[in-house]
């Protein structure tokens, strides 16, 4: 999906009002310095591409974050404010459902969500130069 035509300000507002709080809740009990940010993004469409990938694609050691509150709100915000997003994602979502594992919070998942927090922070500051 090409995130170029999304309403970035509406998505930012959704992040600030709800998604950020859910990410913090998921990470509660974890020190903010525990994980190094290794994933970055260069502009808002790129940030959303990375956020979608880390949130919804299973990775080694973290089978699925898709049922977490922050993930469901991310999906809804993208579906509302990114034209055509629902249509392009519906088949991918159904494929994901077939291979979903049970919900377990592993250290790998915590690391992945820490990366997500960094990507969202970067999304909210689009004018900052890349480090």
């Amino acid at each position: 999906y090409d995130f170029t035509n999304c309403d970035f300000e509406k998505i930012k507002a959704a992040y600030l009002s709800t998604i950020s709080k859910d990410l913090i809740t998921y990470m509660s009990g974890t020190k903010s310095t525990e994980f190094n940010n290794t994933v970055s993004c260069s502009n808002r469409p790129h940030c959303l591409t990375e956020i979608q990938s880390l949130t919804f694609n299973p990775t080694a050691g973290c089978a699925s974050l898709a049922k977490e509150m922050f993930a469901m709100k991310t999906k809804a915000a993208l579906a509302i404010w990114c034209p055509g997003y629902s249509e392009t994602q519906i088949n991918a979502t159904q494929a994901m459902k077939k291979r979903r594992k049970r919900k377990v919070t592993t250290n790998k998942c915590l690391e992945q969500v820490s990366q997500l927090q960094g990507l969202w922070r970067r999304f909210n500051r689009p004018l900052l130069k890349q480090q």
Epitope: D7, I11, A14, S17, A71, A76, I80
Partner: antibody, heavy 121, light 113 residues
């Protein structure tokens, strides 16, 4: 005060198209998204989609893909919703609604009076 | 079939308290999405009654209140008055991409006896 005034009732044949207008006043038209919601007889409310009056950008519920077109004319502060290939189950009251959600989630604080569209052969 | 489930009708005598429930699932209300309530009076434009679960817009009497817990929400009306007779709808959001993202209940008709 904020007002959304919609066009009058329409009767259409199956397969035809209908275009409903919504004239906004009492606020800056280009400052807030306009959504469309409908209510079929005896049914609940159903979200159709939105238009950004500033940019003209739109999005719609999957159900209406390829059938709904949302446009606007900023010079007269009016939003339009056109639904094509009408079927009998499109018979409904269609509402334009202003979105004042500042939290990134749609919140409908002002509604038009509704436009009844009847689809009948 | 609405995503959010409301009782088709409720009734009460003037001065009484009535509640209207709105039941969802883990993909909408249970996921922590806010719930809003709208009042549809016969012959008038619908009106926002409660937003963000329990907040009233200015001009809405404090007889109306909202709450949310788990996968459901409710609207309470105390000191029922004849002019409260209307249809009431809850609204939230849903992460199930195969349906609508902005979702409503089927509506509840309130009759003041």
């Amino acid at each position: 005060q904020v007002q959304l005034v919609q066009s009058g009732a329409e009767v259409k044949k199956p397969g035809a198209s209908v275009k409903v207008s919504c004239k906004a006043s009492g606020y800056i038209f280009t400052g807030d998204y306009m959504h469309w919601v409908r209510q079929a007889p005896g049914q609940g409310l159903e979200w159709m989609g939105w238009i950004n009056p500033n940019s003209g950008g739109t999005n719609h519920a999957r159900k209406f893909q390829g059938r709904v077109t949302m446009t606007r004319d900023t010079s007269i502060s009016t939003a339009y919703m056109e639904l094509s290939r009408l079927r009998s189950d499109d018979t409904a009251v269609y509402y334009c609604v202003r979105d004042r959600g500042t939290s990134g989630w749609p919140l409908f604080d002002y509604w038009g009076q509704g436009t009844l569209v009847t689809v009948s052969s | 079939q609405s995503v959010l489930t409301q009782p088709p009708s409720v009734s009460g005598a003037p001065g009484q308290r009535v509640t209207i429930s709105c039941t969802g699932s883990s993909s909408n209300i249970g996921a922590g999405f806010d719930v809003h309530w709208y009042q549809l009076l016969p012959g008038t434009a619908p009106k926002l009654l409660i937003f963000d679960n329990n907040n009233r817009p200015s001009g809405v009497p404090d007889r109306f209140s909202g709450s949310k817990s788990g996968t459901s929400a409710s609207l309470a009306i105390t000191g029922l008055q004849a002019e409260d007779e209307a249809d009431y709808y809850c609204q939230s959001y849903d992460s199930n991409l195969s349906g609508s993202i902005v979702v409503f209940g089927g509506g509840t008709k309130l009759t003041v006896l």
